[in-house]
């Protein structure tokens, strides 16, 4: 029975050429994460945090994506096509796979809001 | 190479305790859970339950509370079996077992210690 | 909790005879699902995971198929060394039971 919640930073936003974090906490679950995805909105892989090998970010996003803080991913010199959702799926034994949402939206504006609140989606 | 050696044979009398180790090694101990499995003789085997390597917390199977604890050392990238208050019933082979695969798709136990078997008589 | 029954129980067979041996879930587990040979007196060996993938170092005469609830081991040519026991498992949440084993004699 999969009994753990994901939270995640939820709605955020950001502005242009600056970056963000993107978070995803699991609680709630004695599950041990050996491996953490996460994908862009069109289901494609910006990086893999494995338990055993670490790191791997993919080459496409090796310039604007660096690992962490923890399991999660920084994004920098954001540019308008990053607004959209992003995934992150912890790969948990016994209990399964879990995932959480973060919808980004980047704005042109020169005094964008960064709002970055957990909540269960 | 990977392989996970675990302690000898033991025999004990009813009502004793016994610690059963499991020692790892060619692998990043935390980074794979272990678990532990009981083969009575002559039956099939029974997923007592495991242990997150990463935070220390036991996961038992119901049959397997009370009397059975999981614990780890992490300096000697060990796991260790105890169970108290043996009785007769508890006469098995105890394997250790790590879930390999990263992703939820790909589990499995792929590498098991030897077994060590608790003989308990008095 | 999930169950899994395998059949047969006891299955008699000769060197060169193809076998199959199959496990049923109580529920869908997807392809969670793992096979392991046992000689006696020994640890089990991992021969397939995620259903039919088949781990490093394992004869190609074994294959395995399956999803949902059922699934089969398929030995194409026993020898000799396969007349053991062959257990499947789940790893579809907790708790990850064994089937009740699957004896291969010699007929």
């Known amino acids: 029975m999969m009994t753990g919640t994901i939270e995640t930073t939820g709605n955020i936003s950001a502005k242009k050429g600056g970056s963000v974090i993107l978070q995803c906490h699991l609680s709630s679950t004695m599950a041990q994460v050996t491996q953490v995805n996460w994908e862009q909105h069109d289901h494609s892989l910006l990086a893999i945090r494995n338990a055993e090998l670490g790191w791997h970010i993919y080459p496409a996003f090796k310039d604007r994506v660096a690992p962490g803080p923890g399991l999660g991913l920084t994004l920098q010199s954001l540019t308008m096509n990053d607004t959209g959702e992003y995934f992150c799926t912890y790969h948990t034994y016994p209990d399964g796979t879990y995932r959480g949402r973060i919808f980004l939206e980047v704005l042109e504006s020169s005094v964008a809001e960064h709002s970055a609140r957990f909540q269960i989606p | 190479q990977v392989q996970l050696v675990q302690s000898g044979s033991d025999l004990k009398k009813p009502g004793a305790s016994v610690r059963v180790s499991c020692k790892a090694s060619g692998y990043t101990f935390t980074s794979y859970p272990m678990n532990w499995v009981r083969q009575a003789p002559g039956h099939g085997l029974e997923w007592m339950g495991w242990i997150n390597t990463n935070t220390g917390n036991p996961t038992y199977v119901q049959g397997f509370t009370g009397r059975f604890v999981f614990s780890l050392d992490t300096s000697v990238n060990t796991a260790y079996l105890q169970i108290s208050s043996l009785k007769a019933e508890d006469t098995a082979v105890y394997f250790c077992?790590?879930?390999?695969?990263?992703?939820?798709?790909?589990?499995?136990?792929?590498?098991w210690g030897q077994g060590t078997m608790v003989t308990v008589s008095s | 909790d999930i169950q899994l029954t395998q059949s047969p129980t006891f299955l008699s067979a000769s060197v060169g005879d193809r076998v199959t041996i199959t496990c049923r879930a109580s529920?869908?587990?997807?392809?969670?699902l793992a096979w392991y040979q046992q000689n006696p007196g020994k640890a089990p060996k991992l021969l397939i995971y995620?259903?039919?993938t088949l781990q490093s170092g394992v004869p190609s005469r074994f294959s395995g198929s399956g999803s949902g609830t059922e699934f089969t081991l398929t030995i194409s040519s026993l020898q000799p060394e396969d007349f053991v026991t062959y257990y499947c498992?789940?790893?579809?949440?907790?708790?990850?039971?064994f089937g009740q084993g699957t004896k291969v004699e010699i007929k």
């Open positions: 995620a259903a039919s």
């Open positions: 498992q789940h790893l579809h949440g907790y708790p990850c039971n």
């Open positions: 529920q869908v587990i997807s392809s969670s």
């Open positions: 077992a790590r879930t390999g695969g990263h992703t939820y798709d790909s589990y499995a136990f792929d590498v």
